[in-house]
């Protein structure tokens, strides 16, 4: 008799999820010598323990605490780059500017980036058919709770000048409902963070508007100012040139506005 299985609205666990997490962990510890002491099998066991045999709508931050402990890592608090809806460029930037970090440049962020996972209550099975959708099913699902947990802690760790890359091509350049808008903004510590500097990335080559005057950016400025953190904003009119100039800052064309 086939067992009844809950059907969720979201895609199921990424195929070969255990193998992927383990392989990513091994790769990360090989690339980052300061993390070579990490026992990747223990990391996978802690990751698995956070959601296996648990109802996928009833996951808590506490479930991930064993994983958080194993992912302990040094991150220079004044070199943090947050991003919203522009992940690829943010990652391209930190691949060049190696002393800056996005969340996905940390072990925990790297492990989970672009993956989906969930289990089922009272069984040790991973659900590869479907997982809860944040909107249609429930917000306390394994993936959402993981990212909320690590994003909050990443923001809490930040100090001095914190940078955030925002997508100027979106209708809401700053979206209060994004992870940045709903979690990270509210967990920057005013006693540690002096300034939030937004980099608004332009999409069109002929777009010369000052997107720092966008109403949603003004909303972000208001939220940040009320938290006693200074706010500044820069337009990045040519992201391609921006990256090129990060790679080659001595280039003569890099003195002009980008």
């Amino acid at each position: 008799v086939p067992r009844w299985r809950q059907q969720w609205s979201g895609p199921g666990t990424t195929k070969r999820f255990p193998e992927t997490v383990l392989a990513r962990c091994v790769k990360y510890t090989e690339i980052h010598p300061e993390m070579r002491h990490v026992d990747c099998q223990s990391v996978w066991d802690a990751f698995k323990g956070a959601f296996i045999s648990k109802h996928p709508c009833n996951i808590t931050e506490e479930d991930y605490q064993p994983l958080m402990k194993l992912g302990t890592q040094t991150v220079p608090c004044n070199k943090i780059l947050l991003w919203s809806r522009i992940k690829d460029l943010a990652h391209q930037f930190t691949q060049v500017q190696r002393d800056m970090f996005t969340l996905e440049d940390t072990l925990l962020g790297y492990l989970a980036d672009d993956l989906t996972w969930c289990g089922e209550f009272n069984t040790s099975k991973i659900n590869y058919q479907s997982c809860p959708d944040w909107r249609k099913d429930c917000s306390n699902n394994p993936v959402s709770v993981f990212w909320k947990t690590v994003s909050r802690r990443f923001a809490e760790a930040a100090c001095d000048v914190v940078h955030v890359m925002l997508n100027g091509s979106r209708s809401k350049i700053f979206d209060k409902n994004s992870t940045f808008g709903s979690v990270e903004v509210h967990n920057l510590q005013p006693e540690k963070v002096q300034t939030l500097e937004a980099w608004v990335i332009h999409g069109g080559r002929e777009d010369s508007r000052d997107l720092c005057q966008d109403p949603t950016i003004k909303e972000l400025e208001s939220i940040i100012s009320k938290r006693n953190i200074q706010f500044s904003c820069k337009n990045i009119y040519r992201p391609d040139k921006f990256l090129q100039c990060v790679k080659n800052p001595e280039d003569s064309s890099c003195t002009s506005e980008i």
Partner: nanobody, 117 residues
Framework: EVQVLESGGGLVQPGGSLRLSCAAS????????MSWVRQAPGKGLEWVSA????????DYADSVKGRFTISRDNSKNTLYLQMNSLRAEDTAVYYC??????????RGQGTLVTVSS
């Protein structure tokens, strides 16, 4: 600016005890959870223990549970780590840091604990 100064380390025999202190300044100490982390020679960073801002909630790494006790005195802006039944594998530089991790940027110089006979 967050500043911390760790002290209390030293050379101790296996089975012995030490009490580490961390004097904090530059922030409202009582509002922040605090952690002890350590780095053994040639190894990576290991989280040891954390305590809530009020001091009523604590957590420990499995490797130190039952041997180490974290505490704080908010009136003195000071964090403590009482270490009993010390083992050779506890040898490390111990740092205190704000927050519960997993992301740390330690501001102090740390204090070296050496467990050896």
């Amino acid at each position: 600016e967050v500043q911390v100064l760790e002290s209390g380390g030293g050379l101790v025999q296996p089975g012995g005890s030490l009490r580490l202190s961390c004097a904090a300044s530059g922030f409202t100490f009582s509002r922040y959870a605090m952690s002890w982390v350590r780095q053994a020679p040639g190894k990576g960073l290991e989280w040891v223990s954390a305590i809530s801002g009020s001091g009523d909630s604590t957590d420990y790494a499995d490797s130190v549970k039952g041997r180490f006790t974290i505490s704080r005195d908010n009136s003195k802006n000071t964090l403590y780590l009482q270490m009993n039944s010390l083992r050779a594998e506890d040898t490390a530089v111990y740092y205190c840091a704000d927050g519960t991790g997993p992301f740390f940027d330690y501001r102090g110089q740390g204090t070296l604990v050496t467990v050896s006979s």
